[in-house]
Structure formats: structure tokens, C-alpha cells
């Protein structure tokens, strides 16, 4: 249930050179400092628990400052063998191959990881990011070009004495940053190996993991300002819920989407909100320190608990489902856009979600546990919350059974 | 500074096709949708469509289903707009506007001439 | 569709005068309505938006009012760069419909 078990080994209160070793926002992503190669190259990797490679812009793209250059380094071993990874909407591809690899600000250790070269792009880099790869954290099994290329965690974990867990802290600015902001703000924390008590108030409630390949986990239950959405639970989770930090949204399957838009909007209703608000196409915006939070609801998703017939709920707040956006041309104004948008492929627990935690991924337990974040944007009325035990009967029901094809689909 | 550049002007034959294309720099191209406006000469305007670069969702206007085709190209943070099967009725000036609150950014224009 | 409906076409005024531009929505679109201006061979330009707030860099001469249906657009102490066609928009529903305009003449 809470996590008042005994301290693990490797599990101390506090890892302060780990602590504000990301950086970035929600809109285009957290990364972290990492080097490959020898001598060491430095790259800022974008931090993805919704994919499985490791892979790095490694020839020159109009949107990288930088890119890995394999033959500057002595340590790098060619796979011979190509890598092609095709998402809704664009694809990368690259040529594998193996690299020393180290997080500065993470666990003292250097590890021999298969990296994905990056050599030809689309839709994939994104223009300012200040992002040079991806660090695919989720499991072997949607790795590409199949699950026999090792992911980067489990190649740490089985060369190390690191822990096999790691956990994150975004933390949403809830005002616009613009580019040398980001550079110099602190956007949350990475810890490998371990949770930092400090960077979480209350206790951590866990859910099962319920299949390794995606993080992918179970929600019994959705509530708008406490009013149940009502919906067979299947639908919650059709056709899967993974917790991604790779995505800036809080994703949900086309009829939940639209059952949670329709009872927003009918709290929210004091205010009458252009239809491109709903679909993420228009900003709303406020004078400046003026916005209205009370009047948008709250969003609770109860989560399968540890215990037979036991959930718990994690709620987000407005501060967390509008998203800041500076544009020059309302710059009086705070301006926000609608951080919820629909899915073809399940429910995606994206930043949104996780801006308002400590999400810790257990994956020595099989398990994710979630806390009020110490970090989290909220106002003086209402605050962040994981709450529990609450009673849910039938809970395995909720988990939707895909028919088994090959379907991987990263960082959307 | 937000800016959108616009193609030059296309002197086309009825039946035929054109592609317009719309650069924009000064912002994060995936992060806002495009649109594209009709102005005849002398009239008022009309909302064609409009295209998320980050993931290619479209919605048009259904009076230009069939006939405007938007793309995007976020190497070159692009869009592309293609007119097809062209009358005079599609002689016009079309403008690109980004997304905001209403359309705060437009393009310079485009003007197309239908002419045999 | 929404129909957006500027009466009248024309307005004549001398510099230093006050006018006001209206906009008649065939339904409902709340505060979701910008104006443009839009002067010979150039782009439109983005004056007011939420039927109210003035786009950065917009003079506060110009100023929008109205919820609903009935939108107005009023000019202070117009200029002689003021000659313009302004159009009406409402961004509350697709597809978006702007009116017909109202071209600003000086006396």
C-alpha cells in the first residue's frame, strides 16, 4: 500500500547529486546531461519511459547544436546493424552499435550501452528542444529493431550494483519559459537507483505494473470535480494506460476524451471557451494573474492498488492540465493551452500527469508508485493529491487484452 | 519576430493544379496550428483549413474538401497548401495564419490567377 | 455555419473623429471574436481579440466590446492610416466565418 516499509539497500533519502539533473519542459520534453564515447561526448538526452532504445542524433540536423561522432570515439563497436523506428507521425532511423556511457549528474558508474546512431530524421528532433537524443527507460520488449537489443537501464543494472529502479520529478514551470530560461531554470530530477524523500510530501502509493513492455498500468475509475465519469472501466484502459514522459499530454481514448471534455466544460461553464480550446488548436488566455483556476475542475484517476480490491487516486489540478504559452502577440496576457487531447492507443499518463508527482518506477517490484510532488504548480485553495485506500471490486476487469501483433508505438 | 513568407504569385491553367507554401520562423513550428484564408479581389475572406504540424490532424472547411490539400514539412518549418482541378472561381489571394488567440500571424499572400 | 454580418459596408469620418464598427453573429459565440484590419494590397492585421483585448503593439485608440451576438469596434480619434477595410471573426466554432468587412473612408 505506502511505502513505511524498511529503507532497501540503495535506497537512502537522499541522492543530491542526482537532485535537478533535468532540465526542459513540458511542452517539448525533460532531458539529462549524458557523455558517450571516449573521450567522453556530452549530449543533453531526452528522458522517454515510453520507449525502450537509446538512441542520438549522430549526423548534422538543422535543429542540433551537436551529435555524436562515433569514429572521435576509441570505444565505439559497430553492430552492423540497421534500425528503423516509424511513429504515427514521423520516424528516425540509424545504424546500431555499442559506446561507453555515464550520466554526470546520476550514479558514479560507466556503462557499455547499445546506441541507436541517429542518421536520418523526420518529425522527430524538435526546433529548440536543446535535446540530442532519446534515453528509452521502458522494457526490452518494445525495443527496436526487436527485444533482444538490451535497453539502456537494464545494461546499467546488470553491469552495476544500481538498484534496478529510477524515479522522476518534472516540474512544470506554470508560467512560459522563453529559450535561455529553460537553459538556466531547473526543470526536476532523475534518480537512479533510488527515492529522494525530499522531492515528495505524504506517502508513495503503488500500482502494479501490469505488463513489462510499456510502463502500463491499470485505472479503475476517473472523477471531474468528484463526479465519476461513469464508463465501463475497460474503456479507461482501451487500448492500454502507460505512464509516458515522453509526451506532453494527459492522452485519453477518443469516448473517455469526450465524456472529460463534456464535463469540463460543464464546470467550467461560467465561461463560454472556443471549440479550438478543446482540441488544443486555440489558447485561452487572462490578464495577466488573473486566471481563473477555480472555476476549471479537478481530475482524479484511481489506480489499481497493491491489495486485492484496493485503489488509490492521484488528482491533478488546472495548474497542471493548462498549459503556459508565451506568444508575442497576447504577451499582457497569461495564455494557456488545453494539455488533454485524444488517443488512438490508449490512455498516455504524459507530463501533465507527472508534473503534479515523484513517479518512482519500480521495476524491481514490478510496480509505480506515486506522491504528491514537492514541486507541483498549485494556488492556495486546492493542491495536488494521492489519496487512499478506497474499495474497488472487479479491478482486473478493467485491463483491456490486446490481440498479440507486433504494435510499438513511441513518444507521440 | 514571428514571420511568415509566403510563394510568389502563379499565373495556372484552368484544370490544372498549384502548391503554395508558407515558411514560418520566430517560433516552434510543431507548437501551433496553420491555417489558410481565400480573399477574391475585392471580397472578404474565407477559412480553408488548418494543419497541426505536430501530428498532421487536419480540419477543413467542407466547402473546400476536394479541393485544398494542406501539408507540412517541420524540417523546414513549411506548410504547404495544393489547390487541384482549378477554375476561375479559385483566383484569389490565400494567406497563411498561424494560431494563437484567433489568428494573430498572417502571411504577405499569395495571389493565383486562373487563366487560359 | 456561424454567420457573421457587418451592415455597413461604407463609413466616411475626418480625422479626429470617433467610429464604431459593428458585427451581428447568427448565434452565440460568447467573447470569441477578433477584429482585423486590413489595408490596400496588404495582409490583415490583428487588432482585437476575446472580442476585447487589444493584440500587443495595437494603439489603444482602438477598442472592441460585446458577448453573444452583438460586437462592436470603435475608432478614437481617427487617423488618416486608419483607411482600412475591418473584418470581423468568430473563432468559437469551425468553420471560422468572418464578415463581409466595412470600409473606413476619411473625409
Known amino acids: 500500500e505506502t511505502d513505511e516499509e524498511p529503507e532497501e539497500p540503495g535506497r537512502r533519502g537522499s541522492f543530491v547529486e542526482m537532485v535537478d539533473n533535468l532540465r526542459g519542459k513540458s511542452g517539448q520534453g525533460y532531458y539529462v546531461e549524458m557523455t558517450v564515447g571516449s573521450p567522453p561526448q556530452t549530449l543533453n538526452i531526452l528522458v522517454d519511459t515510453g520507449s525502450s532504445n537509446f538512441a542520438v542524433g549522430a549526423a548534422p540536423h538543422p535543429f542540433l547544436h551537436r551529435y555524436y561522432q562515433r569514429q572521435l570515439s576509441s570505444t565505439y563497436r559497430d553492430l552492423r546493424k540497421g534500425v528503423y523506428v516509424p511513429y504515427t507521425q514521423g520516424k528516425w532511423e540509424g545504424e546500431l552499435g555499442t559506446d561507453l556511457v555515464s550520466i554526470p549528474h546520476g550514479p558514479n558508474v560507466t556503462v557499455r550501452a547499445n546506441i541507436a546512431a541517429i542518421t536520418e530524421s523526420d518529425k522527430f528532433f524538435i526546433n529548440g528542444s536543446n535535446w540530442e537524443g532519446i534515453l528509452g527507460l521502458a522494457y526490452a520488449e518494445i525495443a527496436r529493431p526487436d527485444d533482444s537489443l538490451e535497453p539502456f537501464f537494464d545494461s546499467l543494472v546488470k553491469q552495476t550494483h544500481v538498484p534496478n529502479l529510477f524515479s522522476l520529478q518534472l516540474c512544470g514551470a506554470g508560467f512560459p519559459l522563453n529559450q535561455s530560461e529553460v537553459l538556466a531554470s531547473v526543470g526536476g530530477s532523475m534518480i537512479i537507483g533510488g527515492i529522494d524523500h525530499s522531492l515528495y510530501t505524504g506517502s508513495l502509493w503503488y500500482t502494479p505494473i501490469r505488463r513489462e513492455w510499456y510502463y502500463e498500468v491499470i485505472i479503475v475509475r476517473v472523477e471531474i470535480n468528484g463526479q465519476d465519469l461513469k464508463m465501463d472501466c475497460k474503456e479507461y484502459n482501451y487500448d492500454k494506460s502507460i505512464v509516458d514522459s515522453g509526451t506532453t499530454n494527459l492522452r485519453l481514448p477518443k469516448k473517455v476524451f469526450e465524456a472529460a471534455v463534456k464535463s469540463i466544460k460543464a464546470a467550467s461553464s461560467t465561461e463560454k471557451f472556443p471549440d479550438g480550446f478543446w482540441l488544443g488548436e486555440q489558447l485561452v488566455c487572462w490578464q495577466a494573474g488573473t486566471t481563473p483556476w477555480n472555476i476549471f475542475p479537478v481530475i482524479s484517476l484511481y489506480l489499481m492498488g497493491e491489495v486485492t480490491n484496493q485503489s488509490f487516486r492521484i488528482t491533478i489540478l488546472p495548474q497542471q492540465y493548462l498549459r503556459p504559452v508565451e506568444d508575442v502577440a497576447t504577451s499582457q496576457d497569461d495564455c494557456y493551452k488545453f494539455a488533454i487531447s485524444q488517443s488512438s492507443t490508449g490512455t498516455v499518463m504524459g507530463a501533465v500527469i507527472m508534473e503534479g508527482f515523484y513517479v518512482v518506477f519500480d521495476r524491481a517490484r514490478k510496480r509505480i508508485g506515486f506522491a504528491v510532488s514537492a514541486c507541483h504548480v498549485h494556488d492556495e485553495f486546492r493542491t495536488a493529491a494521492v489519496e487512499g485506500p478506497f474499495v474497488t471490486l472487479d479491478m482486473e476487469d478493467c485491463g483491456y487484452n490486446i490481440p498479440q501483433t507486433d504494435e510499438s508505438t513511441l513518444m507521440t | 519576430e514571428v514571420q511568415l513568407q509566403q510563394s510568389g504569385a502563379e499565373l495556372v491553367r484552368p484544370g490544372t493544379s498549384v502548391k503554395l507554401s508558407c515558411k514560418a520562423s520566430g517560433y516552434t513550428f510543431n507548437n501551433y496550428w496553420m491555417h489558410w484564408v481565400k480573399q477574391r479581389p475585392g471580397q472578404g475572406l474565407e477559412w480553408i483549413g488548418m494543419i497541426d504540424p505536430s501530428d498532421d490532424d487536419i480540419k477543413n472547411n467542407q466547402k473546400f474538401k476536394g479541393k485544398a490539400t494542406l501539408t507540412v514539412d517541420t524540417s523546414s518549418s513549411t506548410a504547404y497548401m495544393q489547390l487541384i482541378s482549378l477554375t476561375s472561381e479559385d483566383s484569389a489571394v490565400y494567406y497563411c495564419a498561424r494560431s494563437g488567440v484567433a489568428l494573430p500571424y498572417w502571411g504577405q499572400g499569395t495571389l493565383v490567377t486562373v487563366s487560359a | 455555419d456561424i454567420v457573421m454580418t457587418q451592415s455597413q459596408k461604407f463609413m466616411s469620418k475626418s480625422v479626429g473623429d470617433t467610429v464604431s464598427v459593428t458585427c451581428k453573429a447568427s448565434q452565440d459565440v460568447g467573447r470569441n471574436v477578433a477584429w482585423y484590419q486590413q489595408k490596400s494590397g496588404q495582409s490583415p492585421k490583428s487588432l482585437i481579440y476575446?472580442?476585447?483585448h487589444r493584440y500587443s503593439g495595437v494603439p489603444d485608440r482602438f477598442t472592441g466590446s460585446g458577448s453573444g451576438t452583438d460586437f462592436t469596434l470603435t475608432i478614437s480619434n481617427v487617423q488618416s492610416e486608419d483607411l482600412a477595410d475591418y473584418f470581423c471573426q468568430q473563432y468559437n466554432s469551425y468553420p471560422y466565418t468572418f464578415g463581409g468587412g466595412t470600409r473606413l473612408e476619411i473625409k
Open positions: 476575446s472580442a476585447s
